[in-house]
């Protein structure tokens, strides 16, 4: 008869659900890489750029081996929500220099939103709590200059690229344990 009304439906095949999340993550990873390369071509980066408001990279030397699915999905969703906010901010406040990348940033935002919806669905199917971010959301002020927005874009795309790599590796690693 299925689960009682109002309770989350537990997926009959978590591997298939994970697969579809991995696919979207890999697609977004490819998009991010392409856009980061375009950014480097148009606005060459001088070294590493960082942005204090971005999430710290979830993966460190010891963490991948001890990952558990709830932790990965929760952390990934929280981090991607932060990156979504940053991409929205870039599109809104990036200034004229980033306007040339508007179609690509718009497509990236749409893919990010789609992946977040898929993660939300996966978490509800696995009956995992939809965790809220630990820290309060800090409002993002306008970039100090045109160069500031370019540096921010480099940092956002670079961080998202690494986060998505962590996600693909983590999700595929977990899939082998299911």
């Amino acid at each position: 008869p299925g689960p009682p009304a109002g309770s989350p439906r537990v997926s009959s095949d978590p591997r298939a659900d994970l697969d579809s999340a991995v696919l979207l993550t890999r697609s977004l990873l490819a998009d991010t890489r392409q856009l980061a390369a375009q950014m480097r071509d148009k606005f060459p980066a001088d070294g590493d750029h960082s942005l204090d408001s971005l999430p710290t990279l979830a993966m460190s030397a010891g963490t991948l081996g001890s990952l558990q699915l709830p932790g990965v999905l929760t952390r990934l969703r929280v981090d991607l929500m932060s990156y979504l906010r940053h991409v929205q901010w870039l599109r809104r406040a990036g200034g004229p220099s980033l306007k040339t990348l508007e179609p690509e940033l718009g497509a990236l935002q749409a893919r990010l939103e789609r992946l977040l919806r898929r993660l939300q669905l996966l978490m509800s199917r696995l009956a995992l709590p939809q965790a809220a971010p630990d820290q309060p959301v800090i409002p993002l002020g306008p970039p100090a200059s045109a160069w500031g927005s370019i540096r921010a874009a480099h940092a956002i795309l670079g961080g998202l690229h690494l986060t998505l790599d962590w996600a693909v590796r983590g999700l595929l690693l977990l899939k082998t344990r299911l």
């Epitope: 697969d19 579809s20 696919l23 993550t25 890999r26 697609s27 990873l29 490819a30 890489r33 990279l57 993966m59 460190s60 030397a61 963490t63 991948l64 690229h161 690494l162 998505l164 790599d165 962590w166 693909v168 590796r169 595929l172 690693l173 899939k175 082998t176």
Partner: antibody, heavy 119, light 111 residues
């Protein structure tokens, strides 16, 4: 020119450990993962694991978990693979290879390091 | 783990001929438009060299006579007109899941 240069051949006794280095040049070291692949005589190529140089986070083929250890020295753009408790079946050529993030295809390879395990 | 089986194990052809190498996976390595199969060439005493990634994309610097096709479980590497330097061993590899695995290779020899 993008290059991966590996350390020289090693001869080891059973039970010993070996540590191979792989120096990257010609690209941004942290933009790609570093993968390690084994090629034993008459056997198919075998993926050992990979490491993200930005974070130092490795993942392993279950077959090598516990015996292989992957590390990086970001400042020297160098990756390392250590293999412990060596046995005769570990006699092989070991390659480091540059891996595309999230996709595991390898577009640049080191020249290979021959490891011979013999008593 | 996904097992890749390559056929034939060896193939003897002459320069100028067309070579067709096959790789079959024990389960599908394709999902929604992506096929996670890659092809490498290896010559004796050398490291493998990437030819084709994601089933049909030619790596930079690889001659256009090489092409890849297929989806699901069946994939093909085609060399349209063999040159002397193409005689080598060819491997397919998947990256659909962890761990990535390789086929046993097809040795392409001069007839």
């Amino acid at each position: 020119e993008v290059q991966l240069v590996q350390s020289g051949a090693e001869v080891k006794k059973p039970g010993a450990s070996v540590k191979i280095s792989c120096k990257a040049s010609g690209y941004t070291f942290t933009d790609y993962n570093m993968d390690w692949v084994k090629q034993a005589p008459g056997q198919r190529l075998e993926w050992i694991g990979d490491i993200n140089p930005h974070s130092g986070g490795p993942i392993y083929n279950q077959k090598f978990t516990g015996r292989a250890t992957l590390t990086v020295d970001k400042s020297a753009s160098t990756a390392y693979m250590e293999l412990s408790s060596l046995r005769s079946e570990d006699t092989a050529v070991y390659y480091c290879a540059r891996g595309e993030l999230g996709h595991w295809y390898f577009d640049v390879w080191g020249q290979g390091t021959t490891v011979t395990v013999s008593s | 783990d996904i097992v890749l089986t390559q056929s034939p194990a060896s193939l003897a052809l002459s320069p100028g001929e067309r070579a067709t190498l096959s790789c079959r996976a024990s389960k599908s390595v394709s999902t929604s438009g992506y096929s996670y199969i890659h092809w490498y060439q290896q010559k004796p005493g050398q490291a493998p060299r990437l030819l084709i990634y994601l089933a049909s994309n030619l790596d930079s610097g690889v001659p256009a006579r090489f092409s890849g096709s297929g989806s699901g479980t069946d994939f093909t590497l085609t060399i349209s007109s063999l040159e002397e330097e193409d005689f080598a061993t060819y491997y397919c590899q998947h990256s659909r899941d962890l761990p990535p695995t390789f086929g046993q290779g097809t040795k392409l020899e001069i007839k």
